[in-house]
């Protein structure tokens, strides 16, 4: 039986959710007037890059779209992007697709996502509404790297 990705709405401690704006992900306040993305999450079967201390290796996609989160270096800086890719195509690959992989770690009731390609770089939202979801190596006051994964029916 083929595995299915788990579905979540994603929210931070300031009640910001992830929203698709064109082909970019931005953070916006939880509000009736905006439609948050449903995040698809599925574990990677290949253990080549695994590191249990950092968490489980997962692929992240946008439900209802052939879009997956992807890390690439732009002008020398690790950058978070969306790439046209079906999450199940990544899952069925025998070899781990490193740029699409994230370490998913639980910190209390929150989730943290660290790039496998760029260790020490985490998915983050800024404190300002409407800004893109990005990668940061600075966890703390100005960036939020802890997220709540809310079950959606």
């Amino acid at each position: 039986r083929e595995a299915a990705p788990k579905s979540y709405a994603i929210r931070d401690s300031r009640q910001m959710v992830w929203v698709l704006s064109g082909n970019s992900l931005i953070a916006a306040p939880l509000s009736r007037s905006i439609k948050p993305v449903t995040l698809h999450l599925i574990a990677c079967r290949d253990t080549e890059f695994s590191d249990k201390e950092k968490g489980n290796m997962v692929y992240l996609g946008i439900k209802g779209k052939d879009l997956c989160l992807f890390c690439a270096e732009i002008q020398g800086k690790p950058t978070l992007q969306l790439k046209e890719k079906n999450i199940m195509d990544l899952y069925v690959e025998k070899k781990a697709q490193k740029p699409f992989l994230f370490f998913h770690n639980k910190e209390g009731s929150t989730s943290v996502f660290q790039s496998v390609s760029y260790p020490g770089w985490f998915i983050a939202t800024s404190t300002t509404s409407g800004q893109p979801i990005f990668l940061t190596k600075e966890r703390g006051i100005t960036n939020n790297t802890n997220f709540y994964l809310d079950s959606v029916e």
Epitope: A9, Q15, P29, L30, Y148, D150, S151
Partner: antibody, heavy 122, light 111 residues
């Protein structure tokens, strides 16, 4: 249908700790995406949010009360509780518990308890 | 002092239209968090009247409507009735406080 009922002592002495419980019926306190809050209303005044706890166990407190407030959940009794320490006469109020759901009421409170009056006096 | 500002009182004659304003800031209403409105009849708990800026829960008459623009929101009541006499509160979320905020309340008197 979700219902909330506050309970606890109606009289608390100054400098002591106020303790209230909200019993949830018609649904589970651990149900996904719900948040549970405490709001108070001093006599003749407006509403003040004290703090909240959600289904993940995450707590959020009013910065002006944070040093004195603890909110917790007892899943076995389907209840959540408020503790407010070092009370003074200024804490005399009707205390309400209320709830909402993240992706349905969008940070509003759609179900409220009937409220309980707590008087701080020696 | 409340984070959201409302007029202390408004009044109107039966059948008239009244509006109640609610002014916030760039960290709450202006940051695009929703505004909710509550009606509190004398001696009772608040009741959700409008949620998500302009949506009525089932059972709330369509005489009540909400709107939002910039850092402000307003509640309108048309065809004023004696039973509308109550206190009305706006509420939103404030990211700088990481918490829920209320207006100071507005007492509506039906003349």
């Amino acid at each position: 249908e979700l219902q909330l009922q506050e309970s606890g002592p109606g009289l608390v002495k100054p400098s002591e700790t106020l303790s209230l419980t909200c019993t949830v019926s018609g649904g589970s306190i651990t149900a996904s995406n719900y948040y549970w809050g405490w709001i108070r209303q001093p006599p003749g005044k407006g509403l003040e949010w004290i703090g909240s706890i959600d289904y993940t166990g995450s707590t959020y407190y009013n910065p002006s009360l944070k040093s004195r407030v603890t909110i917790s959940v007892d899943t076995s009794k389907n209840q959540f509780s408020l503790k407010l320490s070092s009370v003074t006469a200024a804490d005399t109020a009707v205390y309400y518990c209320a709830t909402g759901k993240y992706y349905e009421t969008y940070l509003g409170f759609d179900v409220w308890g009937q409220g309980t009056l707590v008087t701080v006096s020696s | 002092e409340s984070v959201l500002t409302q007029p202390p009182s408004v009044s109107g004659a039966p059948g008239q239209r009244v509006t109640i304003s609610c002014t916030g800031s760039s960290s709450n209403i202006g940051a695009h968090y929703d505004v909710h409105w509550y009606q509190q009849l004398p001696g009772t708990a608040p009741k959700l009247l409008i949620y998500g800026n302009d949506n009525r829960p089932s059972g709330v008459p369509d005489r009540f409507s909400g709107s939002k623009s910039g850092t402000s929101a307003s509640l309108a009541i048309t065809g004023l009735q004696a039973e509308d006499e109550a206190d009305y509160y706006c509420q939103s979320y404030d990211y700088s406080l990481s918490g829920y905020v209320f207006g100071g309340g507005t007492k509506l008197t039906v003349l």
